[in-house]
């Protein structure tokens, strides 16, 4: 197979007869050099995933449910190209599948039982199996057949192409469970009519189907969403209140070897040539031989995927929680209103050690997960297979942004006993010079930097977004000579000055020697001209606090801080010389884990934390030489945040503005994925 | 600060049993956390089993049923009784009391159990 070549999977003869065409008509419009197209026709969509998996094939544009069973092993395949609806300027790629209530009713997600529920059709997503598959370890046991365990939970359903016969209460609503548009309660108008009637008390559908049916929004303000978290909210905020975001049409690739960027350069041509309104001779949206064929008709282009986004993100941990419960029909044993233990997720082996003494001391009710990124990290959080961790700032907006929510912040100043229920303002970021230089703010340039890592707050977002705002360009590494910013590309001048070892050299965690706030200290102190940290640091390892071999003999008064007017001042002015006030660091979770969190770490703080004195005899969570680990070593408490309960509130406008801001010089392929 | 030295390991058919030990040059009555880790080729070191001062217990998942851990502060000794071997069992086992903090990557020889038939 020439490596240029795209071996496109087709299910059915009218299949491949397009797809022939589509060979014939790129080869047309290519140049011989380009990607080119080749048919492999398979039964059914399922073979194609094999086929590609094996190498006999190497793309097909799979429905939801069916990216599922692709990224499932031995499969493992991963989404590159997405279809998207609607217009170029506002694309959609996917939906939101959601359940529907009329406001004057006044039950919540976890009071279903017993109510009427309109259904789009058996074994629809938004209308069976995204909330089915959610509401399923609430539905009575034994769960098989599913539709009897289905019509013992609701009071009456009408769920369209269900067995009436067998299973009469799914065909209350509707008599016979008519499979077509003369049930009048079919499909996702036909459930919301459901409602609408007044037959039903609950309608699962898209979250488009509102609007269509109601153009008035008078009208709509009668209804609200349930949302997961057992609370309601307006119709319109459904980005932020629904059952799982349902990826429409997607193109599969293999994870290794998968020639995605040469599918995309395939795609990318021919959306050009053949897609929506662009050619009379083949139309890459439609066809005479039939519907749908190898893409949607309803389609209007395609996007390529983020790189990071792996098929777990894609699909969302709400849509594979209900695919795997509906497949698995497996329920966790305890009660599901009871907390599980809480997976911590540690970066690399240093934090895994500490948070395994951790787990010990908690008697397991603290597991751990181990990942090699703070991103890693956050995405396996996103993805269920850690549940939180605490964060500087700059990745708690990355994780909002992924659709994680701030549980309790770190505080460093407040005693006990009030601090738990205070809201601290932030530490300062501070640029650390040594006494002995002639340097300002005003001529960094060409000089050598420490940076905590790429993104993080004080040593990344506040100082390089001062000086974007200053120089107008992401080059970062072209204004200092050599730095070390853990995290940047491993070629790049900010690597330069990295301590590694090898492997890890420059690489965002504890195994770089340079890393995090007491790492970029010891850049300074050992090569740099400038650490960009907390207010915190010279103090915290001068004086001897510090008993590693760099920093013990180290004095404070041989530092000093650089302030913004292009004056110098002494490590303990932070108040009047600083680059910015910096959000504390702060725990985050998913929302449907964020109660259990914070519930278990008040308790594990009570135990563990900045009460216990003697921690070389005893486990202590706020302690590790210096290191911070999981937490900073300075945290006194973790804090309830009352109603800052968002990462914009959290974070604050200003901060929220500069990050954004720094997103045009943006390093992050999560953050890419996550705004995808 | 106090030496650990493990023991006990060997070659066993799968099914079979071994005790590790685990003895400390000094003390080990003012120590909190004691734990088992074991370490297979191109694995990552993984907690196998822990104990507190009190006697609250942690076991990883793949061991639990199969080992216990022990530790008698007069003897200044930590044990794994492990039962019920399975090859994937198959690792260089080692002990740690965290004292050196999380930070200085120092294990001991540590000892190799072979889990075989």
């Known amino acids: 197979v020439p490596e240029k070549s795209v071996r496109w999977c087709a299910v059915s003869e009218h299949e491949a007869t397009k797809c022939q065409s589509f060979r014939d008509h790129m080869k047309s419009v290519l140049p011989s050099n380009g990607p080119s197209v080749a048919c492999v026709k398979k039964a059914s969509h399922l073979d194609c995933i094999r086929a590609i998996a094996a190498n006999e094939a190497d793309a097909v544009t799979l429905d939801a449910g069916l990216v599922y069973d692709a990224y499932l092993a031995p499969n493992n395949l991963k989404p590159v190209v997405a279809e998207f609806y609607g217009s170029k300027e506002d694309p959609q790629t996917f939906y939101y599948a959601v359940a529907v209530v009329k406001k004057d009713s006044d039950f919540q997600m976890n009071q279903l039982r017993g109510r009427k529920s309109c259904h789009t059709g058996l074994g629809r997503s938004a209308g069976w199996n995204i909330p089915i598959g959610l509401l399923y370890c609430d539905l009575p046991e034994p769960r098989k057949p599913l539709e009897k365990a289905v019509a013992n939970f609701f009071s009456g359903s009408c769920v369209p192409c269900a067995d009436g016969t067998d299973f009469p209460q799914l065909c209350q609503l509707c008599p016979g469970c008519g499979c077509s548009t003369l049930n009048q309660y079919f499909s996702y108008s036909g459930a919301f009519k459901c409602l609408k009637d007044g037959a039903g008390d609950v309608a699962f559908v898209k979250h488009s189907t509102i609007f269509e049916n109601l153009a008035n929004k008078a009208d709509r303000d009668q209804y609200e969403l349930l949302c997961l978290d057992n609370t309601r909210k307006s119709v319109d905020e459904y980005k932020d209140c629904h059952l799982a975001r349902v990826p429409s049409h997607t193109v599969v690739a293999r994870s290794v070897g998968g020639k995605e960027d040469l599918i995309w350069e395939l795609l990318n041509q021919a959306q050009e040539h053949f897609g929506k309104d662009k050619s009379k001779e083949f139309q890459l949206f439609s066809s005479p031989h039939g519907k749908d064929l190898l893409f949607k008709d309803s389609a209007h282009g395609f996007l390529k995927v983020p790189p990071r986004m792996d098929a777990k993100m894609y699909l969302g941990y709400e849509y594979i929680t209900a695919i795997r419960n509906l497949r698995e029909g497996t329920c966790p044993e305890a009660p599901t209103d009871e907390c599980k233990p809480v997976k911590w997720c540690a970066l690399s082996h240093h934090e895994r050690l500490k948070c395994d003494e951790w787990s010990v001391n908690s008697a397991g009710k603290i597991e751990c997960e181990s990942a090699e990124t703070t991103e890693d990290c956050i995405a396996k959080i996103m993805n269920g297979e850690a549940d939180a961790m605490s964060l500087d700032g700059g990745f708690v907006y990355i994780a909002g942004m992924c659709g994680l929510v701030p549980v309790l912040a770190e505080n460093y100043n407040t005693p006990n006993p009030n601090c738990e229920n205070t809201a601290e303002e932030g530490y300062f970021a501070v640029a650390v010079v040594k006494s002995s230089s002639d340097l300002t703010w005003d001529n960094l340039k060409g000089k050598k930097s420490c940076h905590t890592a790429v993104g993080r707050t004080a040593g990344w977002n506040i100082p390089m977004g001062l000086l974007y705002s200053k120089i107008n360009h992401c080059r970062f590494d072209e204004f200092f000579s050599e730095g070390c910013a853990p995290g940047s590309e491993k070629n790049s001048s900010l690597c330069k000055l990295c301590m590694g070892p090898s492997p890890n050299l420059c690489e965002p965690n504890n195994k770089e020697g340079y890393y995090g706030y007491t790492g970029a200290f010891r850049c300074l102190v050992e090569k740099g001209d400038v650490a960009f940290v907390k207010h915190q640091t010279v103090p915290q390892n001068t004086g001897g606090k510090n008993p590693d071999a760099w920093a013990k003999n180290l004095k404070e008064e041989d530092y000093e801080l650089l302030c913004l007017d292009g004056s110098r001042k002494s490590v303990q002015e932070p108040a009047n010389c600083h680059l910015a006030r910096a959000p504390n660091h702060a725990v985050v979770a998913r929302k449907d884990k964020a109660d259990c969190v914070q519930t278990l770490l008040l308790d594990q703080q009570r135990m563990f934390g900045s009460s216990v004195t003697d921690c070389s005899s005893n486990f202590c969570l706020f302690e590790s030489k210096t290191k911070d680990l999981l937490f900073r070593d300075d945290t006194v408490c973790l804090a309830k945040l009352h109603d800052r309960n968002t990462y914009e509130k959290y974070l604050g406008e200003e901060y929220v503005k500069a990050v954004t801001n720094l997103r045009k010089c943006s390093t992050s392929p999560l953050l890419e994925a996550c705004t995808f | 600060e106090v030496q650990l030295v493990e023991c006990g390991g060997g070659l066993v058919q799968p099914g079979g049993s071994l005790r590790l030990s685990c003895a400390a040059s000094?003390?080990?009555?003012?120590?909190?956390?004691m734990a088992w880790y074991r370490q297979a080729p191109g694995q990552q070191r993984e907690l196998v089993a822990g104990?507190?001062?009190?006697?609250?217990?942690k076991y990883a998942d793949s061991v639990k049923g199969r080992f216990t851990i022990s530790r008698d502060n007069a003897k200044n000794t930590l044990y794994l009784q492990m039962n019920s071997l399975k090859p994937e069992d198959t690792a260089v086992y080692y002990c740690t009391d965290y004292s050196r903090g999380y930070y200085q990557d120092y294990w001991g020889q540590g000892t190799q159990v072979t889990v075989s038939s």
């Open positions: 104990i507190t001062r009190s006697g609250s217990t």
């Open positions: 000094g003390s080990i009555a003012g120590i909190n956390t």
